[in-house]
């Protein structure tokens, strides 16, 4: 019958001619009277046999990542004759792995978006890598993940790629941060391949900034002869936060007189001061009252942040009319 | 590193000018407004000036305004205070301070969250 | 606009120091507090009453309420000698308060 061990040859391999092992009939008794034959893909081209000894080189350098088994039949015949001396058998040689392909993040551009103040611990997004080389083989294809830019704000779990918020992020400080995240094969043993890709981090809004009034005082005129519903003038206050964080509903929060009113302009977030009841310069020529400016809506948990509202003090000077 | 570095400053008599730099870098230089902090030796910090990112404003303290000019080029990452008519009072260590918050916000929300080592002026005849 | 700080607070180590800086309606502003050592520019502690800023450890916390924002360093260390300056803005202008000494007896 025939007699061979396991066929395994490294892939990469540099030299002409790489021994691999040998295929031979327990019927050859070394007298040269057998001849060996291969047969099947990649034989004569990829691999060789000595026709004497059954001996079968490769001869071609592989890649086990292209391709990872040959299955090849073998012959030997009795030269005196010219008949098989064994039935034609098939056998496999398999193509053995070696650390030559980096790890490669496949779904780049990683983008994600998680809500700023978030809390330590929080899953932004995971981040995986592959490796073409045989996951079956040692450490060559074992990966682990490491963070080269981002600290302190994100960090990474070193055996999924799952990037988790370490330090509490303000969006109107930073919107958006960059993150490097590299996978080392070999688990980060010497002789370790590795690959890197970058994830966009955008903050989105909370709203964790209250509105306050750029002017602590207004100075405001209204004529005597002005009709109620008349608009004296517009207030402003700022809030750094973005889309409905930032609405905002002003009111009056002191007016002994109950002479104006403060209504919301929601397309531009200002204030209008409106004449609620006619005013008489001969009576009173001058108002103070205050004005007060809180987000339109405020979660509870986002309470903290809106403590006190802000307020400014409007003085409105009436201006006289002559009257017949 | 993110760093601002002050330069110009120096022994000067009253009612003369002097400019002084403050050169950025580590950070895009004009996405920033940026303050000018002083202190008087032994003494408290008075904030000085202001100017946006894009130079669109500037706020001057009481104490300055008219004599005291701020302004920037975002093209040598550099922001300069120009004083005239300097007084004793104005004799301390200036500071650049970066306004903290990302462009587009106001900035009247935030402090300074990066500052130079200072540069002295003194006033004396 | 006029913010004002006690001159000086003294702490024993692993205390509780609480640093007030008050103003009119100060509540209703967003308020800053630097820490300052001997010889060194000054480094933001605390910014919007009560978030800290990226490296700054969380025994240092803000509140503001009324006329009154406070600064609270709790386990007081030695290396937390310092001046502290609160600071706020007024319309267009900024305003410090005149600093206070925290000494850790």
């Known amino acids: 019958g025939w007699v061979w061990n396991q066929f395994f040859v490294p892939e990469e391999m540099n030299t002409t001619s790489h021994h691999i092992g040998q295929l031979r009939s327990d019927l050859d008794n070394g007298n040269n009277s057998f001849q060996y034959k291969l047969l099947g893909a990649g034989a004569g081209s990829t691999f060789i046999i000595d026709e004497r000894t059954g001996d079968i080189y490769a001869i071609q350098k592989l890649d086990r990542e292209e391709r990872s088994l040959y299955i090849l039949r073998a012959q030997v015949i009795d030269i005196a004759t010219g008949r098989a001396v064994e039935p034609e058998s098939e056998f496999v040689i398999k193509v053995s792995d070696i650390n030559d392909n980096e790890p490669k993040f496949l779904d780049e551009p990683y983008e994600a978006i998680v809500p700023e103040m978030s809390p330590e611990g929080t899953l932004v997004i995971q981040v995986t890598a592959s490796d073409a080389d045989d996951p079956s083989s040692g450490n060559n294809a074992r990966l682990l993940y490491s963070l080269l830019q981002g600290q302190p704000y994100f960090s990474v779990e070193p055996t999924t790629g799952v990037i988790r918020i370490s330090s509490k992020m303000d969006r109107e400080l930073q919107d958006e941060y960059w993150v490097i995240i590299q996978a080392k094969d070999m688990i980060g043993q010497p002789g370790a391949l590795s690959g890197t890709t970058s994830v966009l981090i955008k903050l989105s809004d909370v709203n964790d900034n209250k509105p306050i009034f750029k002017e602590s005082l207004y100075r405001l005129t209204v004529s005597e002869s002005a009709p109620t519903g008349t608009s004296i003038g517009t207030i402003m206050a700022y809030d750094n936060d973005i889309g409905e964080n930032a609405e905002m509903d002003y009111s009056i929060e002191e007016d002994d007189s109950q002479t104006f009113d403060i209504i919301t302009n929601h397309e531009t977030q200002e204030g209008i001061v409106i004449l609620k009841k006619k005013v008489d310069f001969e009576h009173q020529n001058h108002y103070g009252i205050r004005a007060k400016v809180k987000n339109h809506h405020v979660p509870e948990q986002l309470m903290k942040y809106h403590t006190e509202a802000s307020t400014t003090f409007i003085k409105i000077q009436v201006e006289d009319v002559d009257e017949p | 590193q993110v760093q601002l570095v002050e330069s110009g400053g120096g022994v000067v008599q009253p009612g003369r000018s002097l400019r002084l730099s403050c050169a950025a870098s580590g950070f895009t230089f004009s996405r920033y407004g940026i303050h000018w902090v002083r202190q008087a030796p032994g003494k408290g910090l008075e904030w000085v000036a202001v100017?946006?990112?894009?130079?669109?404003?500037?706020y001057y303290a009481d104490s300055v305004k008219g004599r005291f000019t701020i302004s920037r080029d975002n093209s040598k990452n550099t922001l300069y205070l120009l004083m005239n008519s300097l007084r004793a009072e104005d004799s301390a260590v200036y500071y650049c301070a970066r306004r903290a918050g990302i462009p587009g916000t106001t900035g009247y929300y935030y402090g300074m969250d990066v500052w130079g080592q200072g540069t002295t002026v003194t006033v004396s005849s | 606009y006029e913010l004002t700080q006690p001159p000086s607070v003294s702490v024993s180590p692993g205390q509780t120091a609480s640093i007030t800086c008050s103003g009119d309606?100060?509540?209703?502003?967003?308020v800053y507090w630097y820490q300052q050592k001997p010889g060194q520019s000054p480094i933001l502690v605390i910014y919007q009453d009560n978030k800290w800023p990226s490296g700054i450890p969380e025994r240092f916390s803000g509140s503001n309420s009324g006329n009154t924002a406070t600064l609270t360093i709790s386990g007081t260390q030695a290396m937390d000698e310092a001046d502290y300056y609160c600071?706020?803005?007024?319309?267009?202008?900024?305003?410090f308060g005149g600093g206070t000494k925290l000494t850790v007896l």
């Open positions: 100017i946006w990112y894009d130079g669109s404003n500037k």
């Open positions: 309606r100060l509540g209703e502003k967003y």
């Open positions: 600071q706020a803005w007024d319309s267009s202008t900024v305003v």
